[in-house]
Interface confidence: low
C-alpha cells in the first residue's frame, strides 16, 4: 500500500534570483485531485493554499510582492490528497539581489580571445563578502564561486566557442544574498578557420533585461528556468 | 528610506464615510501589499483588509464587508481606505502598514465619528 | 479566524530585570508569528517576525521563540525606552489576527 504520494515540483517564476522589494512566485505542482499545498519556509509552515475545485487544478502559487532578505532562503513543498501526504519537493533556494554594493568584472587577457588561449575573470568588491558568483548568462548558465577578501579569481582555463556570451558577477553576502550584478563583459571568442561561423547561443534573457530580469516572465521558459535553477542551486548547496 | 505618510485627522458625523490616504515612497509601490489596521482608543490592533497596489486586488475583513472599500492611485504611489456607514464605534486611529510582516507603518489617522 | 492570547495583559519590572511575555495561538500556526511594540501615540514597530527572527535594528536583547501554539517574546535586560505595550500578530491565515497586548510598565 503506497504510504506517499510522488513529490511536487518546485520553482520560482520568473527566477530564484530576485532583487530585492520585487515580486516573485513560488509554484509547486503537484497532482490533480490534492486538496491542500504547504509551502516550507527554512523547515517550518510558511504558506498553506488549498485549491478549489482540487480536481481541475495541480499547480498552486505562493506570491511574494516585496522580496527581502528575510524572504530569502530555503522552500520546499507538499501537498494531500485526502489524507496522504505527498513526499517533499526538492530545496527551492530563493536568493535576494540588488543588496548593498555592485561589484567590478574583469576578463584577461581580454574581451575578445582565440580558441585555446587560457582566459581568468576577476571578481572584485571592496566591502565585506568572501564569496563571489560567476555568472554566463543563457538558459544553461554556469554559476562558478569564487573565494577571496575582496577579490575572486575565476579561472576558464583554454577557452573554446563553448565560452562565447556575456558574463557577469555578484558578490554573496550568504548564501541568500547577492549584491548587485556588475555590468556585463562579453567574451567573444574566434575559432579556426572552419569554426568561425557564430553557432546558435543558449536561449539567453532579453538582451536589455538582466537589469530587471524579474520582470520578465517567458511562460516558454519556465521549465528551462527550473532546469537552469537547478544547475545553479547546485552551486549554493 | 521607506516612508507611509497618511492624510489628517477627520471628525465625521454618524452615517458619513471617510477616506484615509497612504502615500509610499522609498520603495516601488506596486509590490508591496499595503494592509490597513485600526485601534480604538486604549483598544488593541484590529486588521481591517489590504490592496495589492499592482493588481488592485483587495480583501476584507469579514467584520467590515460591505462598507470597507481599498483603492489605489499607482501613478501617485497612493493607497486609499474609505470606511462608510460611520457609526461612533469606528472611531479610532486608522493604520496603513506594508508587506506581510508589517514592516513599515503608516503614522495614524484618527478619525472621530460624532454627531 | 485564529485567536491569540497573550499574557499577561500588563506587567512592572525594573530597569535591568528579564521580561517574558507569552502568546497562545486558538490553533497550530506553525512559526507564523511577529511581535510588535508600540509607544503611546505611535504607530507600532516590527520586532521579529517569523517567531524569532529579529528585525533589522532592532536590540539583541529582544528574542523570540516557539512555533505551533505557544510563543515567548524575552527583553534580557529591560531598559528605560522598552516601556511600552507588546503585541504578537500571526500571519498563518486570513485574517491576520492580533493578541490584545501587554503593558510593559515601570515598577
Known amino acids: 500500500q503506497q504510504q506517499t504520494l510522488p513529490k511536487p515540483f518546485i520553482w520560482a517564476e520568473p527566477h530564484f534570483m530576485v532583487p530585492k522589494e520585487k515580486q516573485v512566485t513560488i509554484c509547486c505542482q503537484g497532482n490533480y485531485g490534492a486538496v491542500e499545498y504547504q509551502l516550507h519556509f527554512e523547515g517550518s509552515l510558511f504558506a498553506v493554499d488549498r485549491p478549489k475545485p482540487p480536481e481541475r487544478i495541480n499547480k498552486v502559487q505562493f506570491y511574494i510582492p516585496d522580496m527581502n532578505s528575510r524572504m530569502a532562503g530555503q522552500y520546499s513543498c507538499i501537498y494531500r490528497v485526502g489524507e496522504l501526504w505527498s513526499e517533499p519537493s526538492n530545496l527551492l533556494d530563493l536568493v535576494v539581489t540588488e543588496m548593498y554594493d555592485t561589484p567590478t568584472l574583469s576578463v584577461h587577457p581580454g574581451p575578445e580571445v582565440i580558441s585555446g588561449e587560457k582566459v581568468t575573470f576577476y571578481c572584485r568588491l571592496d566591502t565585506a563578502t568572501s564569496m563571489f558568483l560567476l555568472l554566463k548568462e543563457g538558459r544553461s548558465s554556469h554559476v562558478q564561486r569564487g573565494y577571496g577578501k575582496v577579490q575572486a579569481e575565476f579561472p576558464l582555463g583554454p577557452v573554446t566557442t563553448a565560452h562565447r556570451g556575456t558574463y557577469r558577477c555578484f558578490g554573496s553576502y550568504n548564501n541568500h544574498a547577492w549584491s548587485f550584478p556588475s555590468e556585463p563583459v562579453k567574451l567573444l571568442v574566434t575559432g579556426d578557420i572552419e569554426n568561425t561561423s557564430l553557432a546558435p547561443e543558449d536561449p539567453t534573457f532579453p538582451a536589455d533585461t538582466w537589469g530587471t530580469y524579474l520582470l520578465t516572465t517567458e511562460t516558454g521558459l519556465q521549465k528551462d528556468h527550473a532546469l537552469w535553477d537547478h544547475t545553479a542551486q547546485n552551486l549554493l548547496r | 528610506q521607506v516612508q507611509l505618510v497618511q492624510s489628517g485627522a477627520e471628525v465625521k458625523k454618524p452615517g458619513a464615510s471617510v477616506m484615509v490616504s497612504c502615500k509610499a515612497s522609498g520603495y516601488t509601490f506596486t509590490t508591496n501589499n499595503i494592509h490597513w489596521v485600526r485601534q480604538a482608543t486604549g483598544q488593541g490592533l484590529e486588521w481591517m483588509g489590504y490592496?495589492?497596489?499592482?493588481?488592485?486586488?483587495?480583501k476584507y475583513s469579514q467584520r467590515f464587508q460591505g462598507r470597507l472599500t481599498l483603492t489605489k492611485d499607482t501613478s501617485a504611489d497612493t493607497a486609499y481606505m474609505e470606511l462608510s456607514s460611520l457609526g461612533s464605534e469606528d472611531t479610532a486611529v486608522y493604520y496603513c502598514?506594508?508587506?506581510?510582516?508589517?514592516?513599515?507603518w503608516g503614522q495614524g489617522t484618527l478619525v472621530t465619528v460624532s454627531s | 479566524d485564529i485567536q491569540m492570547t497573550q499574557s499577561p495583559s500588563s506587567l512592572s519590572a525594573s530597569v535591568g530585570d528579564r521580561v517574558t511575555i507569552t502568546c497562545r495561538a486558538s490553533q497550530g500556526i506553525s512559526n507564523a508569528l511577529a511581535w510588535y511594540q508600540q509607544k503611546p501615540g505611535k504607530a507600532p514597530k516590527l520586532l521579529i517576525y517569523?517567531?524569532?527572527r529579529l528585525e533589522s535594528g532592532v536590540p539583541s536583547r529582544f528574542s523570540g521563540s516557539g512555533s505551533g501554539t505557544d510563543f515567548t517574546l524575552t527583553i534580557s535586560s529591560l531598559q528605560p525606552e522598552d516601556f511600552a505595550t507588546y503585541y504578537c500578530?500571526?500571519?498563518?491565515?486570513?485574517?491576520?489576527?492580533f493578541g490584545q497586548g501587554t503593558k510593559v510598565e515601570i515598577k
Open positions: 502598514a506594508r508587506t506581510y510582516y508589517f514592516d513599515y
Open positions: 490592496i495589492n497596489p499592482g493588481s488592485g486586488k483587495a
Open positions: 517569523a517567531a524569532s
Open positions: 500578530q500571526q500571519h498563518y491565515s486570513t485574517p491576520p489576527t
